[in-house]
Interface confidence: low
């Protein structure tokens, strides 16, 4: 999937399996990514687990779990708030669009999370105070945690290079991967561009991600995934000057 | 957890009987309770690095000290016998201090926190 980190780095990650996105004293988010096509290096998010840890007199520990074709509007215990404590309503799940869009607000830690199902796959966006991000027991033992540290270099796809190399061609390969199987319905480059331009008129990294995803999969739902990801940034990002990211800010080796 | 911030919180609340906005003639006693609270947080500081409740308390104490013109030096108070649930925004009036604290623990007395964003989408 495409990742925008807390430090506004933009990466395309081919990580498969379960990986932690966020892990601190208050919140643990883990995603499971699966290949979009058999044998493809590109992966998308098929499962998401969010753990809100027990917090003082506000909320009990709560677990939220979403999977492909299952975007519940409740925690796994069936509740929609933080439990039985006095401040339980400082953690709330709201269903925005049934089966497609859920918002979780954890006011006690100033955090808003948006989870969507777009097509077969999930998207995730969060707005969180730096103080919460930095609330960890031991920085030295912090494992790989994607929102903070990004993907390991060997798990990144240079999709901008791919984007440049595929102008005028259909999707035939993936950077950093063996030749990807042809998508069931591969778009010509021009069609991909046109479809992405419709939803994403600014040629930023979200637009480029959209083009990459269409060329890689032929699945038009990925246009909406990029569109909603940008919409979520508009809602959640505190710096309105950083809504759009462009090539010059892309992650370089050495991080 | 070795961080004893909740103990400091409850001692402060028992010392002030949960009064949210002490009247001016209560201020010396309130300041003494605040100084005790500050002392308690300093004692547990080393084990509370990165603890959200701890940092909230430290900011809250500073704000309340300045609001009530409390001097940093002066007498401290002993906690009373009965304790109340710890709460965060002690200067706010509310029927339910715990909810107030939970709802507002990141909209503290001063500036809005620095927010950050992370997102994951597509392939």
């Amino acid at each position: 999937p495409h990742l925008r980190t807390f430090t506004d780095r933009f990466q395309t990650c081919k990580v498969q399996g379960a990986w932690p996105l966020i892990d601190n004293n208050y919140l643990n988010v883990q995603v499971t990514n699966t290949p979009v096509l058999p044998g493809s290096a590109a992966t998308a998010t098929s499962k998401l687990t969010i753990i809100f840890k027990n917090f003082q007199e506000c909320v009990d520990q709560k677990v939220y779990q979403a999977e492909m074709d299952e975007l519940p509007a409740a925690f796994v215990d069936g509740s929609k708030n933080g439990g039985d404590k006095h401040g339980a309503n400082s953690l709330k799940i709201t269903e925005k669009v049934s089966g497609q869009h859920v918002e979780i607000r954890a006011k006690y830690i100033g955090t808003t999370i948006v989870v969507r199902q777009v097509g077969r796959y999930l998207t995730f966006a969060v707005r969180v105070p730096e103080e919460v991000v930095n609330a960890v027991e031991d920085w030295d033992s912090q494992g790989l945690y994607l929102c903070l540290r990004g993907c390991p270099l060997n798990q990144q796809i240079d999709f901008q290079a791919f984007h440049t190399n595929t102008e005028g061609t259909g999707a035939r390969r993936l950077a950093a991967a063996s030749p990807a199987p042809t998508a069931p319905e591969t778009f010509p480059y021009e069609t991909a561009v046109a479809k992405c331009k419709e939803k994403l008129p600014v040629e930023d990294l979200y637009y480029q991600a959209c083009v990459f995803d269409l060329l890689t999969t032929g699945d038009v739902n990925f246009t909406l995934a990029a569109y909603y990801a940008l919409e979520d940034v508009k809602m959640l990002h505190s710096n309105k000057d950083k809504l759009h990211l462009y090539e010059r800010t892309r992650d370089l080796p050495g991080r | 957890s070795p961080c004893k911030i909740l103990k400091c919180n409850s001692e402060f609340w028992s010392a002030t009987s949960g009064s949210h906005a002490p009247a001016s003639d209560d201020t010396p006693e309130f300041c003494a309770a605040l100084r005790s609270y500050a002392l308690c947080t300093r004692r547990t500081a080393r084990t509370c690095r990165g603890d959200l409740a701890y940092h909230s308390a430290v900011h809250g104490i500073e704000d309340l000290m300045s609001q009530h013109n409390c001097s940093k030096d002066g007498p401290t108070s002993q906690p009373r016998l009965h304790t109340l649930p710890p709460a965060g925004d002690s200067q706010e009036r509310s029927d339910s201090p715990e909810i107030c604290h939970c709802e507002k623990s990141f909209h503290k007395h001063s500036a809005t926190p620095n927010y950050t964003h992370c997102g994951l989408f597509g392939d």
Epitope: G17, A18, P20, N28, Q30, T32, T49, D60, Q61, K62, V63, Q65, F75, V76, D77, G78, S79, G83, D84, K85 | -
Partner: antibody, heavy 120, light 109 residues
Framework: EVQLVQSGAEVKKPGASVKVSCKAS????????ISWVRQAPGQGLDWMGW????????NYAQKLQGRVTMTTDTSTSTAYMELSSLRSEDTAVYYC?????????????WGQGTLVTVSS | QSALTQPRSVSGSPGQSVTISCTGT?????????VSWYQQHPGKAPKLMLY???KRPSGVPDRFSGSKSGNTASLTISGLQAEDEADYYC?????????FGGGTKVTVL
């Protein structure tokens, strides 16, 4: 102190049912799930299922589906596990354990165990 | 047959370190953050020793530690003591069922 106190030992005949209780104290009963785990003599631990006292949601081990029923009574903070159509291989110590918000969570507090003997 | 495989027994002298492995599949161990470990003395209820692979509940000595590599989770007891002699079980969650390992008897020589 957080505690789970279970009912006493039972002797049952094959084909009968048994209902074991587990009374919780020292914490908010609806804030945690309850899992049931059994242990046959000289054997390892065997997970039976999970119930959320908050919602009544259950998650049973596949091999026990249809034979096990887990319930809770929030007014008395008590969880119950009923196993029907008992057979001799159901002879075991049955434990209740407190877990987090989902069936997959760790079990941080355990009851003392209830020995159920199935014998003709 | 348990879906999580543990050695039947391990032993060590006081002060030594012993490691117990717990091998499963990618879904039960490899991809899971929900691995926990339990200690059980004869005739007693199990006791939680580690959770979420590496985390130690309060009251559990720091000589108990956890790790995971691939599809194998491990519990290490460093500085073995007489009271550590017990059965140890790993637990994880795969799909719909919670799984326990078959148990490992730790003997202090």
């Amino acid at each position: 102190e957080v505690q789970l106190v279970q009912s006493g030992a039972e002797v049952k005949k094959p084909g009968a049912s048994v209902k074991v209780s587990c009374k919780a104290s020292g914490y908010t009963f609806t804030s945690h799930g309850i899992s049931w785990v059994r242990q046959a003599p000289g054997q390892g631990l065997d997970w039976m299922g999970w119930i959320s006292p908050y919602s009544g949601n259950t998650n049973y081990a596949q091999k026990l589906q249809g034979r096990v029923t887990m319930t809770t009574d929030t007014s008395t903070s008590t969880a119950y596990m009923e196993l029907s159509s008992l057979r001799s291989e159901d002879t075991a110590v049955y434990y209740c354990a407190r877990v987090g918000s989902g069936p997959y969570y760790y079990m941080d507090v355990w009851g003392q165990g209830t020995l159920v003997t199935v014998s003709s | 047959q348990s879906a999580l495989t543990q050695p039947r027994s391990v032993s060590g002298s006081p002060g030594q370190s012993v490691t117990i492995s717990c091998t499963g599949t990618s879904s039960s161990v490899g991809d899971s953050i929900y691995v926990s470990w339990y200690q059980q003395h004869p005739g007693k209820a199990p006791k939680l020793m580690l959770y979420d692979v590496t985390k130690r509940p309060s009251g559990v000595p720091d000589r108990f530690s956890g790790s995971k590599s691939g599809n194998t989770a491990s519990l290490t007891i460093s500085g073995l003591q007489a009271e550590d002699e017990a059965d140890y079980y790993c637990k994880s969650y795969a799909g719909t069922d919670t799984l326990f390992g078959g148990g490992t008897k730790v003997t202090v020589l």
